[in-house]
């Protein structure tokens, strides 16, 4: 899998497309998971309804929300309220058993709000009570991974 | 006007087998998932499964006591529902009921079951 | 898997009392809550779905409002034909409902 990077604004909201085959994953729940390391864990996030056909409902997990179009093959994941430490490596998944198939690797950047909150004047960030619902998501940048770029690079 | 009617229902023994039928008629039986609810007496509701609409190709989900044991299937040709229950259990007596999913105006469903059947009675006894 | 709590399992109200019953979640469940009437011996009804919208033909004298894990029904103005046991019922999980509420006239 390549990798494919999606930048969003510190403190704004970032949304990742997982795009998969329908008929491949049909009746199949999915995930999105946080990479620890290169060779660790990928460690679940938040999931997709335990009933397959309740996959649209969204669900939450913190600043994170999911929902799958389970017929058109793409899940949504919404990071609300984007920080520094939500940057990192991602899998979206499907469930099958107690495997899981990678459908996409993700690299989430959080790029420093240009405008700065304090001097932001009209501009409305959502706070933290307001819902997934209400919040304004910005378009995410994304791009695949140069062959050559090293996701995880060495740490000294 | 929309009408679900439920029959098959019965007096069987502990391990035998009874199938349940929902006849639907007024609506289009095949753009709405169609769910099974029972209630034993004096009890409250609980829900065993539902069927997706023709869009989701009668994928079935159930509640986990009831999982390998019943089976829901559909005939869009004939706009029925059924619950076929297998290897019976005293504690499955119960009225059983069908139900449909509301849509909403979009096309989406949403898990609220806005059409009900008069229900059907099941007694699983020796 | 949630579990529904709904209080009180019976109650008592005169014809025109305003009249409350609670569903509690036992973790958030977003707005993902429908409350039904069942009146004895016939099928369950829809009144509200997604936790305040009322299902059509409903009398508005019924509402219900909430969201996370507190949510509440009501009653405005109790009539003689709500004589009946309301149950909440829960679907960000499975679909469980709660242990119903009994209203009587007094």
């Known amino acids: 899998h390549n990798t494919t990077v999606f930048q969003g604004v510190e403190g704004q909201s970032l949304q990742v497309s997982c795009p998969y085959d329908s008929m491949k994953h049909w009746g199949r729940r999915k995930a999105w998971c946080r990479q620890l390391g290169e060779k660790g864990p990928c460690q679940r996030v938040v999931s997709t309804h335990n009933l397959w056909l309740l996959s649209f409902l969204r669900r939450r997990n913190g600043s994170t929300a999911i929902t799958d179009d389970t017929l058109g093959g793409t899940l949504t994941i919404t990071l609300r309220n984007l920080q520094p430490h939500d940057a990192g490596f991602y899998q979206c998944q499907s469930l099958h058993g107690s495997e899981a198939d990678t459908l996409r690797k993700v690299l989430v950047e959080v790029l420093a709000d240009p405008l700065d909150h304090r001097d932001a004047g009209d501009l409305w960030v959502p706070g933290e009570s307001e819902s997934f619902e209400d919040a304004h998501v910005e378009h995410s940048i994304s791009r695949s991974l140069l062959e050559g770029e090293i996701p995880f690079p060495p740490t000294s | 006007e929309v009408q679900l009617v439920e029959s098959g229902g019965g007096l069987v023994q502990p391990g035998r087998s009874l199938r349940l039928s929902c006849t639907a008629s007024?609506?289009?039986?095949?753009?709405?998932?169609m769910s099974w609810f029972r209630q034993a007496p004096g009890k409250g509701l609980e829900w065993v499964g539902f069927?997706?609409?023709?869009?989701?190709?009668?994928?079935?989900e159930y509640t986990a006591s009831v999982k390998g044991r019943f089976t829901i299937s559909r005939d869009g040709s004939k706009s029925i529902a059924y619950l076929q229950m297998n290897s019976l259990k005293t504690e499955d007596t119960a009225v059983y009921y069908c139900?449909?999913?509301?849509?909403?105006?979009?096309?989406?469903?949403?898990?609220?079951?806005?059409?009900w059947g008069q229900g059907t009675m099941v007694t699983v006894s020796s | 898997d949630i579990q529904m709590t709904q209080s009180p399992s019976s109650l008592s109200a005169s014809v025109g009392d305003r009249v409350t019953i609670t569903c509690q979640a036992s973790?958030?469940?977003?707005?993902?809550l429908n409350w039904y009437q069942q009146k004895p011996g016939k099928a369950p009804k829809l009144l509200i779905y997604?936790?305040?919208n009322l299902e059509t033909g409903v009398p508005s004298r019924f509402s219900g409002s909430g969201s996370g894990t507190d949510f509440t029904f009501t009653i405005s103005s109790l009539q003689p034909e709500d004589i009946a046991t309301y149950y909440c019922?829960?679907?960000?999980?499975?679909?469980?409902f709660g242990g119903g509420t009994k209203v009587e006239i007094k």
């Open positions: 997604d936790a305040s």
């Open positions: 973790q958030d469940i977003t707005n993902y």
């Open positions: 139900a449909r999913g509301k849509r909403y105006s979009y096309g989406g469903w949403v898990p609220a079951f806005d059409v």
């Open positions: 019922q829960e679907y960000d999980s499975y679909l469980a």
């Open positions: 007024g609506f289009t039986f095949g753009e709405y998932t």
């Open positions: 069927i997706g609409s023709k869009a989701y190709a009668g994928t079935t």
